[in-house]
């Protein structure tokens, strides 16, 4: 027979030879990191047809790392289903808890013993320090010193000293989230007031108001014979300016050869007339109020 078979889990006892006589026996032992559990044979014999009798390394089992329990408020998950060396043990914490330590341990072989690569981690409750205080505003639960996971606070603005109210810019409600950080930055309370939007040769068709504060939205259309240059809809943004800027109504060219510029808001049409029925509370054309505003 030629050289006997090789295995992942067991190795030949003694030096291998290039050839073996019929009837000659070779013995195997479990490799380092493996241990033998009977009754499977760990030897083979050179048969008279010059082949080795069947043998396997299934009696050699990998050394195993000690069992690790789930951490309190968490879970230990074996990546490949056993505690044998080479195994990975993944740790996750329950919602509302965070991991202190390594989230993966490896079952490693030290000499002939399988041991874990480190200490199992802990799962600690997620806690947040109080959220930021803000100028001209306050948040709920201002007396609380420690917040737990998903605890929420709501910000509100103080009454303004002048005629215009403070607007809350940002998220009014934030919560204690992962990494012990708040879900959003604290909002800001400030007076946001946009100028009255004047459109020559046009008119406002929605969003009428005494004053235009944060997020106020206004829509326009142009008089007959004029087209909208810009957006028909503008919003009062946190820097007290309209975005996009207040549009202009430009005269439609009367020359038959010249193409009128088109509104960026309304596509290739010389005038932009949104259907008035889209704007609740705005009079319908048949009420005779919208006609001839110029």
């Amino acid at each position: 027979c030629e050289a006997p078979p090789t295995f992942e889990a067991m190795e030949l006892i003694g030096k291998p030879k290039p050839y073996y006589r019929v009837g000659e026996r070779v013995d195997y032992k479990c490799k380092k990191g493996y241990f033998y559990i009977p009754p499977l044979a760990t030897h083979t014999i050179c048969d008279r047809n010059h082949t080795w009798l069947p043998v396997s390394d299934e009696g050699c089992y990998r050394e195993m790392c000690p069992h690790i329990r789930d951490p309190l408020n968490g879970e230990a998950i074996l990546a490949n289903g056993s505690y044998e060396f080479g195994a990975e043990l993944h740790f996750i914490c329950n919602e509302g808890y965070y991991l202190i330590g390594k989230d993966i341990l490896y079952c490693e072989l030290k000499d002939t013993v399988a041991i874990w690569s480190g200490k199992p981690p802990l799962c600690e409750k997620i806690l947040c320090t109080p959220p930021p205080k803000i100028k001209n505003g306050k948040h709920t639960f201002s007396e609380v010193e420690v917040f737990e996971y998903l605890d929420a606070v709501t910000y509100s603005c103080d009454p303004a000293p002048g005629p215009d109210p403070f607007s809350l810019i940002g998220e009014s409600m934030i919560y204690c989230g992962n990494n012990s950080t708040w879900s959003h930055a604290a909002p800001e309370c400030k007076v946001v007031k946009c100028r009255f939007p004047v459109v020559e040769n046009g008119k406002q068709i929605s969003g009428f108001g005494k004053k235009f504060y944060y997020k106020a939205t206004v829509m326009f259309e142009c008089d007959k014979g004029y087209y909208l240059n810009g957006s028909d809809k503008i919003v009062c943004e946190s820097n007290s300016t309209w975005d996009p800027p207040v549009p202009k109504c430009l005269k439609v060219s009367t020359s038959p050869t010249t193409k009128s510029p088109t509104s960026s808001a309304s596509g290739p049409r010389p005038t932009y007339k949104p259907p008035v029925s889209n704007y609740p509370g705005y009079p319908k054309p048949d009420e005779g109020i919208l006609n001839n505003l110029d």
């Epitope: 100028r195 009255f196 004047v198 040769n201 008119k203 009428f208 004053k211 109020i289 505003l293």
Partner: antibody, heavy 118, light 107 residues
Framework: EVQLVESGGGLVQPGGSLRLSCAAS????????ISWIRQSPSRGLEWLGV???????NYNSAFMSRFTISRDDSKNTAYLQMNSLKTEDTAVYYC????????????WGQGTLVTVSS | AIQLTQSPSSLSASVGDRVTITCRAS??????LNWYLQKPGQSPQLLIY???SLHSGVPDRFSGSGSGTDFTLKISRVEAEDVGVYYC?????????FGQGTKVEIK
């Protein structure tokens, strides 16, 4: 609080020109939107136009060809240039600070009288 | 341009009377209407903006109402110092225009 004072009024012949001034004290004229309004017994109150803080202007189209509003920040003064004056332009002319960007007029000066007569 | 028509053109009231002045717009103007009072020998002064908001320092006997095309200025108990000419003004559309005025006298 800014004070606006009109000047430059007087007697002018029909067809003539006149430039009215609106001087700001206690504040910068460029920080406010300034409107010109006139008042006469025959025509009542008439809004003539406005110059915005960004230097843009809007006019009453009835006067657009003859009246021009401008501003000289170095002199802290707004102006109303009136050309081709007619007898019906006889009126008291007010420069008026637009209220905080909104078209209501809360800061009237004493006005300056312009008389167009031959 | 949008025309504003005030009525009556003049009225005479006794001190303590309730006075009502109306302003009608030739087109729909939402609530974009202001009221002014010009006392004898003085420049106009703002009383009410955006139909019903009292300007600072204006006594609360003045009130405004209305919407669309019809607007009203009321003086609940007129006083001697309320004499003068009252004007309405629209600002929904350029040119901004004024009513012709209503003269209020005290009997």
């Amino acid at each position: 609080e800014v004070q606006l004072v009109e000047s430059g009024g007087g007697l002018v012949q029909p067809g003539g020109s006149l430039r009215l001034s609106c001087a700001a004290s206690g504040g910068s004229v460029s920080s406010y939107d300034i409107s010109w309004i006139r008042q006469s017994p025959s025509r009542g109150l008439e809004w003539l136009g406005v110059i915005w803080t960004d230097g843009g202007t809007n006019y009453n189209s009835a006067f657009m060809s003859r009246f021009t509003i401008s501003r000289d920040d170095s002199k802290n003064t707004a102006y109303l240039q009136m050309n081709s004056l007619k007898t019906e332009d006889t009126a008291v002319y007010y420069c008026e600070r637009v209220y905080d960007g909104y078209p209501w007029f809360a800061y009237w000066g004493q006005g300056t009288l312009v008389t167009v007569s031959s | 341009a949008i025309q504003l028509t005030q009525s009556p053109s003049s009225l005479s009231a006794s001190v303590g009377d309730r006075v009502t002045i109306t302003c009608r717009a030739s087109q729909w103007i939402s609530n974009y209407l202001n009221w002014y009072l010009q006392k004898p020998g003085q420049s106009p002064q703002l009383l009410i903006y955006y139909t019903s908001s009292l300007h600072s320092g204006v006594p609360d006997r003045f009130s405004g109402s209305g919407s669309g095309t019809d607007f009203t200025l009321k003086i609940s108990r007129v006083e001697a110092e309320d004499v003068g000419v009252y004007y309405c003004q629209q600002y929904i559309k350029l040119p901004w225009t004024f009513g012709q005025g209503t003269k209020v006298e005290i009997k």
